[in-house]
């Protein structure tokens, strides 16, 4: 039978090295065997390049295309082929469809004044346009109480968040994850980072424990482990 595209390709760029396109076929398809996505920068002398798609689901294909460090003027011509049959043709401008890279290395450290210091890394090198454009969302949730969660918007430059231990339940296990977006590029949110988990030991002031006692306890109990949360 004839090959048809049900949902045409939707593409996003991390604006540094990779663009990813995803589309849905009208029936289960072996993407890598049956389809090819050709892409070419609209620029004098640019060659045609071919991406071999992979299956994300039975009928969903995804293609990851290496791109050079993107600039605003870049526009790609995309053609989706099933053998000699052209299924879809379109253009894609990475600067208009940015999905930032996922922030990395999320860690939680005990800090002065009964606070936790959450730190992560900006996923872009300083020379990249997006390095100074990112703002973040941090999700902090109680592992044993789905209704005990907080969302923090980090709109300042540094990839850090200070969290008062008193805002969390004492003795509870909490997980944090972070994602990024670039406002000036009207980007989508990045995927969530892997979660970091820690135990919140906070004794109210009236217990009159010294800071050192509290933080010794925190350091003994404090641990972290990583597990992935997928954002759809």
């Amino acid at each position: 039978g004839s090959v048809k595209v049900l949902h045409e390709p939707s593409c996003f760029s991390d604006y540094i090295s990779t663009s990813v396109c995803q589309w849905k076929m009208d029936h289960p398809t072996n993407c890598s065997a049956e389809l090819r996505l050709s892409y070419q920068l609209d620029f004098m002398g640019s060659e045609n390049h071919t991406c071999v798609p992979e299956n994300r689901e039975d009928s969903v294909c995804v293609c990851s295309m290496p791109i050079d460090d993107a600039v605003e003027a870049d526009v790609y011509q995309l053609d989706l082929w099933a053998g000699q049959q052209l299924l879809w043709s379109g253009s894609f401008q990475p600067s208009k469809h940015v999905k930032p890279r996922t922030p990395g290395n999320l860690t939680v450290h005990p800090n002065i004044s009964h606070t936790w210091l959450l730190m992560w890394t900006n996923p872009y090198p300083t020379e990249n346009h997006l390095h100074s454009e990112l703002t973040y969302m941090v999700n902090v949730s109680n592992d044993n109480d789905p209704e005990d969660f907080k969302v923090y918007n980090v709109t300042y430059m540094g990839p850090t968040l200070r969290l008062a231990a008193s805002t969390l339940k004492s003795g509870a296990s909490y997980s944090a994850r972070v994602r990024a977006w670039a406002q000036t590029y009207n980007s989508t949110w990045s995927d969530w980072s892997p979660s970091t988990t820690w135990l919140n030991y906070y004794e109210p002031w009236e217990q009159h424990l010294g800071l050192n006692d509290i933080f010794e306890a925190q350091k003994i109990e404090w641990h972290e482990h990583h597990h992935h949360h997928h954002h759809h």
């Epitope: 620029f43 004098m44 640019s46 060659e47 050079d68």
Partner: antibody, heavy 125, light 112 residues
């Protein structure tokens, strides 16, 4: 050492044909676009045509479109310019030059960074 | 098509002085910040042209630092400082952004 050696220039009658060759050495020929430029006697430089490294993309000046064909043989490190329906105004020295690096997604540009010595084409009856 | 216009068409400069040539394009040659697709070439009598400057301001390999390019958008300048007798020749600007590529008319530099 990068070298470009053109050949094939000759005296030809109007309406005639000629094929110019440019043999390249000293650089990865297949990775670079190549360009033909000409210069009529006592005149300035005129860009004619460009071909990408794989040969998959070609571009022409309006003055030669439909009459001239640029091609390349990467196995022989050779660039060609097939010239048909020649006219008196095609009389010029023809230069080949190395253009942009096209093996990258966005071609890396260094200008026309090496030129051949040129070959003279004379169109006259 | 992008039209390239050079001024002046001829220039006479004494050794040690600075020569300045202007090149204007009918459309912007800036693809993105730092990427101005404008080159400068020099041609001596009886010789092939040779590249001096590419991307508006980058010197080609082996070119003296007396040659400098500046400008962006549609306005560019080539400056030759401390001019020497060997600098005599015809100077061309060329746009490398889009087909058809195009050269300016050329500026003849004469050393007094």
């Amino acid at each position: 050492e990068v070298q470009l050696v053109e050949s094939g220039g000759d005296l030809v009658k109007p309406g005639g044909s000629l094929r110019l060759s440019c043999v390249a050495s000293g650089f990865p020929f297949r990775d670079y676009a190549m360009t033909w430029v000409r210069q009529a006697p006592g005149k300035g430089l005129q860009w004619l045509s460009l071909i990408s490294g794989s040969g998959g993309k070609t571009y022409y000046a309006d003055a030669v479109k439909g009459r001239f064909t640029i091609s390349r043989d990467n196995a022989k490190n050779t660039l060609y310019l097939q010239m048909n329906s020649l006219r008196a105004e095609d009389t010029a020295v023809y230069y080949c030059a190395v253009d942009r690096l096209t093996k990258t997604i966005r071609p890396q540009y260094y200008g026309l960074w090496h030129w051949g010595q040129g070959t003279l084409v004379t169109v006259s009856s | 098509d992008i039209v390239m216009t050079q001024t002046p068409l001829s220039l006479s400069v004494s050794p040690g002085e600075t020569a300045s040539i202007s090149c204007r394009s009918s459309q912007s040659l800036t693809y993105s910040i730092g990427y101005n697709y404008l080159d400068w070439y020099m041609q001596k009598p009886g010789q092939s042209p040779q590249g001096l400057i590419y991307l508006g301001s980058k010197r080609a390999s082996g070119v003296s630092d007396r040659f400098s390019g500046s400008g962006s958008g549609a306005d560019f300048t080539l400056k030759i400082s401390r001019v020497e007798a060997d600098d005599a020749g015809v100077y061309y600007c060329m746009q490398g952004l889009q087909s058809p590529l195009g050269f300016g008319q050329g500026t003849k530099l004469e050393i007094k």
